[in-house]
């Protein structure tokens, strides 16, 4: 393994993550760990001088940044609050408020907004989709045999009780919002009017 | 410690436009939002917008979209809110306010307030 | 939007009353709240913040309470110079301020 700085023929270093290439000086250079900056660029016969960020501000990754990003409150108006505050390598930590999602934006939560909770009617329940952040439920009828008697955003049509299963025959049958009624069947030798 | 400096007094003519300064010491606006809030005479606080000072990013609430621009400048630590198109009903007491890195959520710091007046 | 309703609107209380302030969000705010006095001619002042914690220096006869829509200032010992008016202020989903609450000494 090689020390920096160290000449290199193809302007490839053999730790990318941690070491660059200084054109300058044609030489492979350190880069300096997360919570640092460059405080000296390096020469030929010198490493990369690396200093801790000053107060509120911080780098992330390993880097060969001249400064440091300043640190960010999580932005209540946009619907964040601080989950873990900002360090010398990484910014604060912000999630949506309770009761709120997030809006994507290339896979970046970019605001919050209010979960808009749809009801599902009774004879109806939430399509189930792949779309795990999607707020906008569709509700679709419960299939034949099948009911829903809530209005509610997750609650599933069940299955019509089958009354034979339990030894009991049906008085009424069941809907898209109701369940089968069952009742006991007649006593044997009863008049059926 | 956090301060913030405000003129007391402004008087603008009705149809014209003044702008109002916050120069904040002790702490760098790059950490910070800075919001305004307007009190006009005998009546309670409203909460105006802010401005990102990191990147001229803002938001306002609807009544002041069209009439005030919020802008701020890093190198001087200051922010600015320009108010256009005056009315008398724009005569208030003008705050501005940070939210930090310590106080993300509350206004702990505020300017002493500029009082617009606005006549002709 | 959510409004903040405070009432009373005005409120006359004598030296070492027990005062209670409220204030009413139109919807669940989650103890997103902030208490502020203000002073004829000064700006306002942080007194509580996140529904029950008291500011570094405000006096510890000030408290707050509450949950979901409902919330509670309250001086257990009234001051002369607690003469002023009170606003709530919530930071859930942005900032509101209510329309306050004007204490005067009998």
């Known amino acids: 393994q090689l020390v920096p700085p160290y000449r290199i023929e193809n302007q490839t270093c053999w730790d990318q993550d941690k070491e660059y290439y200084e054109p300058m000086h044609d030489v492979c250079c350190s880069r300096c760990p997360p919570g640092e900056f460059v405080f000296a660029v390096c020469s030929r016969s010198q490493d990369t001088v690396c200093k801790t960020c000053p107060h509120n501000s911080y780098n992330e990754h390993w880097n060969h940044l001249s400064t440091c990003q300043l640190c960010r409150p999580c932005d209540i108006v946009l619907g964040f609050e601080e989950v873990a505050p900002c360090t010398s390598d990484r910014k604060a930590e912000c999630r949506c408020q309770p009761g709120m999602s997030c809006v994507y934006l290339d896979n970046e939560c970019v605001h919050c907004e209010e979960e808009r909770l749809v009801l599902c009617q009774p004879g109806t329940e939430a399509e189930v989709t792949d779309e795990i952040m999607d707020t906008d439920v569709n509700c679709v009828p419960c299939k034949p045999g099948h009911f829903q008697n809530t209005s509610s955003p997750r609650a599933r049509c069940q299955p019509h009780t089958r009354c034979e299963i339990q030894g009991l025959v049906e008085a009424a049958p069941g809907t898209s919002y109701s369940d089968t009624i069952c009742k006991n069947p007649p006593e044997p030798g009863a008049m059926l009017l | 410690e956090v301060q913030l400096q405000q003129y007391g007094a402004e008087l603008g003519k009705p149809g014209t436009s003044v702008k109002l300064s916050c120069k904040v010491s002790?702490?760098?606006?790059?950490?910070?939002?800075i919001h305004w809030v307007i009190q006009r005479p005998g009546k309670g606080l409203e909460w105006i917008g802010r401005?990102?000072?990191?990147?001229?990013?803002?938001i306002s609430t609807e009544k002041f979209k069209n009439k005030a621009t919020l802008t701020a400048d890093l190198s001087s630590n200051t922010a600015y809110m320009q108010l256009s198109q005056l009315k008398s009903d724009d005569t208030a007491i003008y705050f501005c306010a940070p939210t930090t890195l310590t106080t993300p959520d509350s206004f702990a710091y505020w300017g002493q307030g500029t009082l617009v007046t606005v006549s002709s | 939007d959510i409004q903040m309703t405070q009432s009373p609107s005005q409120l006359s209380a004598s030296v070492g009353d027990r005062v209670t302030l409220s204030c009413k969000a139109s919807?669940?705010?989650?103890?997103?709240l902030n208490w502020y006095q203000q002073k004829l001619g000064e700006a306002p002042r942080l007194l509580i913040y996140?529904?029950?914690i008291l500011q570094t220096g405000i006096p510890s006869r000030f408290s707050g309470s509450g949950s979901g829509t409902d919330y509670t200032l309250t001086i257990s010992s009234l001051q002369p110079e607690d003469a002023a008016t009170y606003f709530c202020?919530?930071?859930?989903?942005?900032?509101?301020f209510g329309s306050g609450t004007k204490l005067e000494m009998k």
């Open positions: 996140s529904t029950n």
């Open positions: 202020q919530k930071y859930y989903s942005g900032f509101t």
């Open positions: 919807q669940n705010i989650y103890k997103y």
């Open positions: 002790g702490y760098n606006i790059g950490n910070t939002y």
């Open positions: 401005i990102d000072p990191t990147n001229g990013n803002t």
